[in-house]
Amino acid sequence: IWELKKDVYVVELDWYPDAPGEMVVLTCDTPEEDGITWTLDQSSEVLGSGKTLTIQVKEFGDAGQYTCHKGGEVLSHSLLLLHKKEDGIWSTDILKDQKEPKNKTFLRCEAKNYSGRFTCWWLTTISTDLTFSVKSSRGSSDPQGVTCGAATLSAERVRGDNKEYEYSVECQEDSACPAAEESLPIEVMVDAVHKLKYENYTSSFFIRDIIKPDPPKNLQLKPLKNSRQVEVSWEYPDTWSTPHSYFSLTFCVQVQGKSKREKKDRVFTDKTSATVICRKNASISVRAQDRYYSSSWSEWASVPCS
Amino acid sequence: RNLPVATPDPGMFPCLHHSQNLLRAVSNMLQKARQTLEFYPCTSEEIDHEDITKDKTSTVEACLPLELTKNESCLNSRETSFITNGSCLASRKTSFMMALCLSSIYEDLKMYQVEFKTMNAKLLMDPKRQIFLDQNMLAVIDELMQALNFNSETVPQKSSLEEPDFYKTKIKLCILLHAFRIRAVTIDRVMSYLNAS
């Protein structure tokens, strides 16, 4: 058993049918010595008396808010949560496996640049009685500071019969140098509590591996005289690291017809312009990627040919 | 990546082309190592990230773009020097182009070159003959060193008398390649910045 926060405790259980569970001793936080009784949650049934209460925690029915009283007055509370270990592996019931970029990916994180700021998000089908707390650091043995905000509900989607909820959090490394070569990964730890169930999820990454630039901005077309060709131009996104000559991007320019089946023409360039043939009803899209370290491509920025 | 490669014109900053080749070569070598050594811990998540140049060179600090010198987090142990020499500086004047930066890059390349050659000698003794260093990568390191044209004493190739542990050697190869790729990215960024200055 360990303390998650003041008066909230997590009991780790080897989870299988007929498991013996864990013996837990609760102590009433009071100078009083006698006349103390214990109850669980809203029930008025007295579970025991005395300054300590010994319980055998086996299932969720044994978890909850234990309260010690004296003469109708509440003295203190202890909330017991359960953390299930199923065949040597901690349970992952609360969050959905996003399966991208690989199986067992519960937390996904992205950074728009090398400033040390990044966003993580996760999915769940649970809508109520759910709380998250996020911590992060650079490295784990001698951790360096990363500050994370509160996790917030960022999107709701309907998937088949189920509603899916997306939560996200923004974090910022306390002293980040955009040009630094990372040797210790960022660690992100999310504590999730649903009703009386506790779970924790972790992700470990280098900022360089989660970079996804914003799409190029100010995408414009300039027709070339007496030609079906157009000059496409764009700019680096505002959120990208500077100077751009050091943090350079490379670009992919795509001409896509109305129908998804039509052949796509693609050109790769390090410049911020390109000359392409603009077909009728087609659209031109441009996306960006770090020129020297191949992390994710940005989303497409698009303009119609007409 | 099937990106078109821009060939620099002769007047252009001469080291840019070499540094681009270096990054391409080390990335290809790392990809090959990860595929060939699939049963070894060779992915970024599995290896320890060690930097053989740590405390010996200071490339990141010495080559920091001027715009980032205002960022205190980037200024741990920055010694700035604006003296320029070395053939890459081909008569281009800018306060950023410092000899310290380019000589630091040169020292990095020299250290990696020695490590890779020593390692290759060990890998050639492996009866499995599973993986060897790409000669093209070694050649590209050499070309960039020549383009930098710094004179420094030659580091003797390390020779080891004991029987090599091939498993450990292959894991060390992965560690070295990951670290060298990261350094090659920094070198490419620096050369691109110098070229634009």
Epitope: Y16, P17, D18, E59, E86, D87, G88, I89 | -
Partner: antibody
């Protein structure tokens, strides 16, 4: 004590369907994940499928994906395996099993796919 | 399709020490715990070892398990006639959990 009693096995022709049941008693069935495992005659153990305690997630072996469906009725304390488009290579003893460091197995039920 | 490899058979005389190996990879045994089962003819498998080296109550202490790197082994110290059975190791793969990965199985024969 924990008991898993299986039923529903038998002889079936290729291409036909069969549903296996596993009735659980002696524990809070709705709190635990459950597996199906099979063993072809004279062969080793092969995992078939898994279902979470609440039925929210189901996982299948590639060899049965799209043909077999694992389900549970927590109000009846019963686990099911619906098997469709049966093939000769599905002939095996099928076991249900609890998920956990200490597991409990059903007695097994024989499924024979033969024309 | 078996990823965990066991020797097809091992044998020993009563009182001898018999060991069965189970060889896997970094993503399964290297990252997860190992179980061992005993299966007597015509019966369901019985758990012998969980969490690599833990014995459930009721399992004789002549059975012991160990794990090192990407391999695990089961030892029967002082093998007895009633130990003649098939033995299976089981683990998970970190990418496909909770799918069970079983070993190929080993037939233990007690001679004499």
């Amino acid at each position: 004590q924990v008991q898993l009693v299986q039923s529903g096995g038998g002889v079936v022709q290729p291409g036909r369907s069969l549903r296996l049941s596993c009735a659980a008693s002696g524990f809070t069935f709705s709190s635990y994940g459950m597996h199906w495992v099979r063993q072809a005659p004279g062969k080793g153990l092969e995992w078939v499928a898994f279902i979470r305690y609440d039925g929210s997630n189901k996982y299948y072996a590639d060899s049965v994906k799209g043909r077999f469906t694992i389900s549970r009725d927590n109000s009846k304390n019963t686990l099911y395996l619906q098997m469709k488009s049966l093939r000769a290579e599905d002939t095996a003893v099928y076991y249900c099993k609890t998920h956990g460091s200490h597991d409990n197995w059903g007695q097994g039920t024989m499924v024979t796919v033969s024309s | 399709s078996y990823v965990l490899t066991q020797p097809p058979s091992v044998s020993g005389t009563p009182g001898q020490r018999v060991t069965i190996s189970c060889s896997g990879g970094r993503s399964n045994i290297g990252s997860n715990t190992v179980k061992w089962y005993q299966q007597l003819p015509g019966t369901a498998p019985k758990l012998l070892i969980y969490w690599n080296d833990q014995r459930p109550s009721g399992v004789p202490d002549r059975f012991s398990g160990s794990k090192s790197g990407t391999s695990a082994s089961l030892a029967i110290t002082g093998v007895q006639a009633e130990d003649e059975a098939d033995y299976y190791c089981q683990s998970y793969d970190r990418g496909t959990h909770p799918a069970l990965l079983f070993g190929t199985g080993t037939k233990v024969t007690v001679l004499g």
